[in-house]
Interface confidence: medium
């Protein structure tokens, strides 16, 4: 029970320490916003995370919290400060009446307030049949003693640290922040409480059934015995990791978050801060057979988000639900009937399923890669995970039709050799959120901070779009796609690459008016063409009869419709060379593709001509895909002729650097 007088003493002190000008207005023109979980049953009203502006100091956070308490007390409300955040995000966690939100939003330094909500373990079911001894052969998977230089933090349930699979490999920290269990008939049973976390620790680093057998782990308890936690508890856990990292810097850190809740601005922000501090975060996509972008931390762009597939490369079905999907998923990994440590006894094994298990596989692979190359950045690691994945093996028919193009068809795999990938030019495709259907709607796709945007394309299911352009935003290039009148919305598609010492710029040619079409080329010395984009203001590009194909011997040139402005992405980087590859089909075709050869990487993907029956262009791995309207609606006129244009690049500099190392 609580000491009531203690609470009031704190309030009285707060009142005394503040001046009379308590209701100080926030900085002019700024309005703090309130956010809450879109999934009503997961809401936890009465507890709020007050997030302060980025540059707020700890002392200001404490003062703001006291100010809130003082103002609330004047109105007869009791409040309780549960935690003051610093290290990751400035702010505080407060228990208070919802009636005080309006007041709290007006406090100085407040950026936004988020109501607390639940997060859940992402494994189903927690106990199937016990398997003792384990149902696998020890000689099937015996990688080198991988991951020994890496520390993996697990934010999950409590764990059975003396299980023979993980004994001596997992350090149980003293961190615990969990809600009480629900329900009237719940009995805490140690084996149930430890079930989820023990299994995942085993999948990551277990002696027999682990991926990275050399990795050491640290566990934080943020999920209760029912596998339930809170956004606020997870935030405090992430802050704990950041503080540990600052106090005692070690080698590379991987943080495994095998949990999911509704979309949370604050949880995503905390993940972003931790990722930018050099920590690799891996999370479960979620088990809701839904768009992963609706969940957190799965929707955080800086986090590696993992969906689940089974042994037949089918997306995992879990009861009536299954793995999440969509553009927020980075890749898939095994997540059905995964054998691992069972908390029922110290030598027991059990199989569990879910995106938690899939995320644990990727955390193990990441630990192996980082142990082999400790200097890898998050962007480099993510690109390598994508590069070494098995491509195009997932049966996409399981996904809703509108999500198939957005969902990566990638299943995580260990690299054939942990060294020697340095010469490769790595690129990945990043899809934006959907723009929405309004006439002037746009969609923006962004690359990670240390990736280069080498090309930009767009896609619309209705075909009504006004193209795309690369533009500067906050000192970085972004890819922006434009919807057209009557369109159902567009996607922007960025091609994001790792290109050290690159200097890239965009050259634009306005609509040509002349009948030969618009052209633009890379005119700076040493700059090569990596991508072409086109954007038009007219609602519907007419058919463009004159040829718009590139004249031979002019590879550094983008061409397009005379009514469109054309944008060329031109880059200079040591040893970078690129070539244009085209595949034109004279007859109308719903899909035209062109791929880059072995040793070359697709950096740009666009369509010629840019007429309205072309739905758009996008890169899938090393293949440029151009989609057109249903052939039956276009007829077999010359308008149906479409050319897919790929720009393929390689870096002789990276190849040489790699050879020198070997």
């Amino acid at each position: 029970q609580e000491d009531e007088d203690g609470d009031y003493e704190e309030l009285v002190l707060a009142l005394r320490s503040e001046e009379d000008g308590l209701a100080e207005a926030p900085e002019h023109g700024t309005t703090a916003t309130f956010h809450r979980c879109a999934k009503d049953p997961w809401r936890l009203p009465g507890t709020y995370v007050v997030v302060l502006k980025e540059e707020t100091h700890l002392s200001q956070s404490e003062r703001t919290a006291r100010r809130l308490q003082a103002q609330a007390a004047r109105r007869g409300y009791l409040t309780k400060i549960l935690h003051v955040f610093h290290g990751l995000l400035p702010g505080f966690l407060v228990k208070m009446s919802g009636d005080l939100l309006e007041l709290a939003l007006k406090l100085p330094h407040v950026d936004y307030i988020e109501e607390d909500s639940s997060v859940f373990a992402q494994s189903i079911p927690w106990n199937l049949e016990r398997i003792t001894p384990p149902r696998y052969r020890a000689d099937e998977y015996q990688p080198p003693d991988g991951g020994s230089l890496v520390e993996v933090y697990l934010l999950d349930t409590s764990i059975q640290s003396d299980h023979r699979e993980i004994e001596g490999r997992v350090m149980v920290t003293d961190f615990e922040n969990v809600p009480e269990e629900d329900g009237t008939r719940f009995h805490r049973q140690a084996s149930k409480c430890d079930s989820h976390g023990t299994h995942l620790a085993g999948v990551v680093s277990g002696r027999d059934a682990g991926v990275a057998k050399g990795a050491s782990m640290r566990s934080l308890r943020v999920l209760n015995c029912q596998g339930k936690g809170t956004v606020s508890g997870t935030l405090i856990g992430l802050e704990f990791i950041r503080k540990s990292q600052l106090v005692q810097p070690v080698g590379p850190l991987v943080v495994l978050l095998p949990l999911a809740g509704g979309y949370s601005r604050v949880l995503n922000a905390a993940c972003q801060r931790l990722a930018r501090a050099g920590v690799v975060l891996v999370t479960a996509a979620g088990n809701f057979r839904d768009d992963a972008c609706l969940y957190s931390p799965a929707s955080a762009p800086e986090v590696i988000t993992v969906g689940a597939t089974n042994a037949q490369d089918q997306p995992v079905t879990l009861g009536t639900l299954g793995t999440n999907f969509g553009r927020c998923v980075d890749l898939f990994a095994p997540g059905e009937d995964i054998i691992g440590a069972s908390s029922d006894c110290s030598t027991c094994f059990v199989s569990q399923s879910g995106t938690s298990q899939a995320a644990a596989h990727v955390a193990g692979i990441a630990a192996m890669m980082l142990s082999a190359e400790p200097e890898l950045t998050l962007a480099e690691l993510r690109q390598r995970l994508i590069h070494f994945s098995a491509k195009d093996v997932i049966n996409e028919a399981w996904f809703p039709e509108d999500q198939r193009v957005l969902t990566p068809n990638l299943v995580a795999a260990l690299p054939p050799s942990t060294h020697g990938a340095g010469w490769q030019l790595f690129c990945r495709t990043v899809w934006s959120a959907h723009s929405g259907p309004t006439r002037m709607a746009t969609a923006v796709a962004r690359c990670a901070p240390d990736e280069e945007l080498l090309s930009c394309s767009s896609f619309s299911r209705s075909g009504k779009r006004r193209g795309e352009r690369m533009e500067a935003q906050g000192g970085k290039l972004v890819c922006r796609a434009h919807n057209a009148f009557g369109g159902e919305g567009v996607y922007a598609i960025a091609r994001c690459c790792l290109l050290p010492q690159a200097n890239c710029s965009v050259h634009t040619a306005p609509p040509a008016e002349a009948s030969m079409g618009t052209r633009v080329h890379c005119h700076q010395q040493g700059h090569v063409l990596t991508g072409c984009s086109s954007h038009w203001e007219v609602e519907d590009l007419g058919t463009h009869k004159p040829p718009v194909l590139r004249p031979r011997g002019q590879p550094n040139q983008c061409v397009g419709h005379r009514e469109a402005s054309i944008h060329a992405s031109c880059c200079h980087a040591p040893g970078l060379e690129c070539k244009v590859k085209e595949h034109g089909i004279p007859a109308p075709q719903e899909q035209v593709t062109v791929a880059c050869e072995e040793g070359w990487t697709l950096t740009g993907c666009s369509a010629l001509p840019g007429t309205s029956h072309v739905l758009g262009a996008y890169a899938v791995d090393n293949t440029c895909v151009v989609r057109s309207r249903d052939v039956s609606t276009t007829g077999s006129t010359s308008e149906g002729a479409v050319t897919a244009v790929a720009i393929c690049c390689r870096s002789r500099h990276l190849a040489q650097a790699s050879q020198e190392l070997q």
Epitope: Q1, E2, E4, D7, Y8, P45, G46, R75, G76, Y77, L78, T79, K80, K95, M96, S97, G98, D99, P179, E180, D182
Partner: nanobody
Framework: QVKLEESGGGLVQAGGSLRLSCAAS????????VGWFRQAPGKEREFVAA????????EYAENVKGRFVISKDNVKSTVFLQMNSLKPEDSAVYYC???????????????????WGQGTQVTVSS
């Protein structure tokens, strides 16, 4: 220091009635919710009913609706639970609890109530 004290428990025949009282002493905040919970042997504590500080707004668990009535004496800071048509399955220790951080919605979660009384035993014989 706020203290909650329950009284009024006892032994009663099935179909009978009891009136439980919860008296709050000390300084309570201006806004709060008082809830009644019960716990039978070997079972988790469960929500029974709750009332806001004004006494005007109440909430009940499905299994007691129409049989139990929660009310508040604003002068004496006492909350009552009138229990009618009692059944053997109503036998439990009844606890009074205070939620000092009320939200627009009532909460039936044990964890949202942060001050508790010692409890009073109610036994309904068949």
């Amino acid at each position: 220091q706020v203290k909650l004290e329950e009284s009024g428990g006892g032994l009663v025949q099935a179909g009978g009635s009891l009136r439980l009282s919860c008296a709050a002493s000390g300084r309570t905040p201006r806004h709060y919710i008082v809830g009644w919970f019960r716990q039978a042997p070997g079972k988790e504590r469960e929500f029974v009913a709750a009332v806001r500080e004004s006494g005007s707004s109440t909430e009940y668990a499905e299994n007691v609706k129409g049989r139990f009535v929660i009310s508040k004496d604003n002068v004496k800071s006492t909350v009552f639970l009138q229990m009618n048509s009692l059944k053997p399955e109503d036998s439990a220790v009844y606890y009074c609890a205070l939620d000092r951080f009320p939200t627009p919605e009532f909460s039936d979660r044990v964890g949202h109530y942060d001050l508790w009384g010692q409890g009073t035993q109610v036994t309904v014989s068949s």
